[in-house]
C-alpha cells in the first residue's frame, strides 16, 4: 500500500524519499527489509539515511532491494517501503522502458518538461538536457530552473528527453540522469467558472504568534491550457503588493498542476513572524478567469 518504486544507474547518485508523510521534528528510521538491519545516518557511509531521505552516493547494482522507513510520529508509527532497483549503465543510446519516468504531454502553448525527482537533490543550475542522447542546442530550447521549455512545439519534438545534473553532498559531486518521454498533442480544452479547492469558504486557520504561517489558495479552471486564469491573495480587499506589509508575501510565480486532467493553480501566501494584528485581517483567496471571479475568505485565529 505504501510502497514506492525508485530506480537509478550504477555510479550515479540516487536519493529516495520515504513514501509516508513526515514532519521535520519526527525521526525516520530506515532498515534493509530483508535483514531488518538499520541503515546508518552517518554521512561517511556510501548508503545513509537522512531524515525522510535515503541516499546512495553513489549507487551500486547490489543496492537493489526493498527498504523500510518508519516515521516515528506520536500515536502511530507510519511505515513505508521503497523498492529500489539499480541498473548497469547502457552502452548504447537507447533508454530502456524500465528507466523511464512518466510521460508528459505538451502543446504549442504549454511545453514544459520537468526533470523528474530533481527536487530531492542538492543541485545548481543549469541543467543539461538531451533528446535521444543528443545535447539540445538552439534558441528554441530554454533550460529554466528544473524544467525545459520548448518554443513553438512541433510534432517532431516528441521523443525521450534526458536531464543531467550534479548532486553535491559535503563538497563531493555525483552525477544524476533522468529520462522521460514527451508527446505533443493538439490542445482541446475548455474553461469553467473557477472552482476553489482550498481554502474552504470562511475557514478559520489557527496560527501561532511569532511563528511563520502559510496559506494556500488553490483553484481549477477547466481542461487544457487556459487563456486567462489566475489565483491571488488579497488582504482586506487590497492586493498584497499594495498592502505594504513586507512580512506578508505571495509566492513568486504560480504553481501549475493538473488534477484529474483539470488545469489548476496554487498561490501560497507566506506570513513571517505572525503578529496579533494579522489576526484582524481578512484574507481573500481569489480565482478568476474569463467566466468570472470566485472568492473564499479565511481568517486567522490564535493558537495558545
Amino acid at each position: 500500500k505504501f510502497s514506492k518504486q525508485s530506480w537509478g544507474l550504477e555510479n550515479e547518485a540516487l536519493i529516495v524519499r520515504c513514501p509516508r508523510q513526515g514532519k521535520p521534528s519526527y525521526t525516520v528510521d530506515w532498515y534493509y527489509s530483508q535483514t531488518n538491519k538499520s541503515i546508518p545516518t552517518q554521512e561517511r557511509n556510501r548508503v545513509f539515511a537522512s531524515g525522510q531521505l535515503l541516499k546512495f552516493l553513489p549507487a551500486e547494482v547490489a543496492d537493489s532491494g526493498i527498504y523500510t522507513c518508519i516515521v516515528r510520529s506520536p500515536t502511530f508509527n507510519r511505515t513505508g517501503y521503497a523498492n529500489v532497483t539499480i541498473y548497469k549503465k547502457q552502452s548504447d543510446c537507447n533508454v530502456p522502458d524500465y528507466l523511464m519516468y512518466s510521460t508528459v504531454s505538451g502543446s504549442e502553448k504549454n511545453s514544459k518538461i520537468y526533470c523528474p525527482t530533481i527536487d530531492l537533490y542538492n543541485w545548481t543550475a543549469p541543467l543539461e538536457w538531451f533528446k535521444n542522447c543528443q545535447a539540445l542546442q538552439g534558441s528554441r530550447y530554454r533550460a529554466h530552473k528544473s524544467f525545459l521549455v520548448i518554443d513553438n512545439v512541433m510534432t517532431e519534438d516528441a521523443g525521450d528527453y534526458t536531464c543531467k545534473f550534479i548532486h553535491n553532498e559535503n563538497g563531493a559531486n555525483y552525477s544524476v540522469t533522468a529520462t522521460r518521454s514527451f508527446t505533443v498533442k493538439d490542445e482541446q480544452g475548455f474553461s469553467l467558472f473557477p472552482v476553489i479547492g482550498a481554502p474552504a469558504q470562511n475557514e478559520i486557520k489557527e496560527v501561532e504568534i511569532g511563528k511563520n504561517a502559510n496559506l494556500t489558495c488553490s483553484a481549477c479552471f477547466g481542461k487544457g491550457t487556459q487563456f486567462l486564469a489566475a489565483v491571488l491573495w488579497q488582504l482586506n480587499g487590497t492586493k498584497i503588493t499594495d498592502f505594504g506589509e513586507p512580512r506578508i508575501q505571495q509566492e513568486e510565480g504560480q504553481n501549475q498542476s493538473f488534477s484529474n486532467g483539470l488545469a489548476c493553480l496554487d498561490m501560497v501566501l507566506r506570513i513571517a513572524d505572525v503578529k496579533e494584528e494579522d489576526l484582524l485581517l481578512q484574507y481573500d483567496c481569489l480565482a478568476l478567469n474569463l467566466h468570472g471571479l470566485r472568492r473564499h475568505t479565511v481568517r486567522l485565529s490564535r493558537k495558545n
Epitope: 521534528s25 525521526t27 506520536p74 500515536t75 502511530f76 507510519r78
Partner: antibody, heavy 123, light 111 residues
C-alpha cells in the same frame, strides 16, 4: 466554525451491523488524522479506531476484525462500519479530530469533538 | 499498551478554593521529538469532552488561566487555582504517545 456532526446510531440486535458517519466542516479535513472514541453510560472514554491522512487504519483490540474505519475526503466525511455488534459495544460514539499534518509546529491531541451518536446493542 | 491512572477518582471542592488532580502513566510519554504527549480534558455533564491542556502544560485556546498543567516523564498534575461552579464535571488525562489511552477520570463537584 469548526464542527463535527455524528449520525447513524440506533438500536441494533447482537450480531447486527450499523454504519456511523461524521460530517466535518470549517477546516481542511484531508490534512487531519481522524478518530472514533466511545463512552459507555457512566463509564470513561475508550479509543476505538483511527485513520490517518494517508488512509492507514488502526483499531483497538476489542473491535479489531469487526469494525472498519474509512474516510471520504471529497465529502469531508468519516465513517465507522460496525459489524458483529455485541452488548459491550453499547456506548456514545464520538468523532474527533487529531493531528494536522499541514502544521509542522504542534500537535493538539484530540482538539475537536462531535456531540456523539448513541449505539445500543440489545435483543 | 500504556496504562493511565488518576488520583483522586472524585473530588469535592469549595468554590474559590484550589484543586489538584494527579495522573501517572505506566511509561514515559516523552517522544523522540522532545515533546511530551499528555493532555487534559474536561467533560461537563451531557457534553462531549473538551480539551484543556496539551503537551503537559499548554492551555488550549479559550481555556481560563486558572487551569494549569505540570509534570514530566510519567507524573503529571492538573491544578485549578480557584474552582468555579462551571468547572464541575469529569477530568480525564490522556496519552497519545502510542495510540490513545485515557485515565479513569476524576469527578469534580462543588461542596
Amino acid at each position: 466554525e469548526v464542527q463535527l456532526v455524528e449520525s447513524g446510531g440506533g438500536l441494533v440486535q447482537p450480531g447486527g451491523s450499523l454504519r456511523l458517519s461524521c460530517a466535518a466542516s470549517g477546516f481542511t479535513f484531508s490534512t487531519f488524522d481522524m478518530h472514533w472514541v466511545r463512552q459507555a453510560t457512566g463509564k470513561g472514554l475508550e479509543w476505538v479506531s483511527s485513520i490517518d491522512t494517508e488512509g492507514d487504519t488502526y483499531y483497538s483490540g476489542s473491535v479489531k476484525g469487526r469494525f472498519t474505519i474509512s474516510r471520504e475526503n471529497a465529502r469531508n466525511s468519516l465513517y465507522l462500519q460496525m459489524n458483529s455488534l455485541r452488548a459491550g459495544d453499547t456506548a456514545v460514539y464520538y468523532c474527533t479530530r487529531g493531528e494536522d499534518w499541514s502544521d509542522d509546529d504542534y500537535y493538539y491531541g484530540l482538539d475537536v469533538w462531535g456531540q456523539g451518536t448513541t449505539v445500543t446493542v440489545s435483543s | 499498551n500504556i496504562v493511565m491512572t488518576q488520583t483522586p477518582l472524585s473530588l469535592s471542592v469549595t468554590p474559590g478554593q484550589p484543586a489538584s488532580i494527579s495522573c501517572k502513566s505506566s511509561q514515559s510519554l516523552l517522544h523522540s521529538d522532545g515533546k511530551t504527549y499528555l493532555f487534559w480534558y474536561l467533560q461537563k455533564p451531557g457534553q462531549p469532552p473538551q480539551l484543556l491542556i496539551y503537551g503537559v502544560s499548554n492551555r488550549f485556546s479559550g481555556v481560563p488561566d486558572r487551569f494549569s498543567g505540570s509534570g514530566s516523564g510519567t507524573d503529571f498534575t492538573l491544578k485549578i487555582s480557584r474552582v468555579e461552579a462551571e468547572d464541575v464535571g469529569v477530568y480525564y488525562c490522556m496519552q497519545s504517545l502510542q495510540l490513545f489511552t485515557f485515565g479513569p477520570g476524576t469527578k469534580v463537584e462543588i461542596k
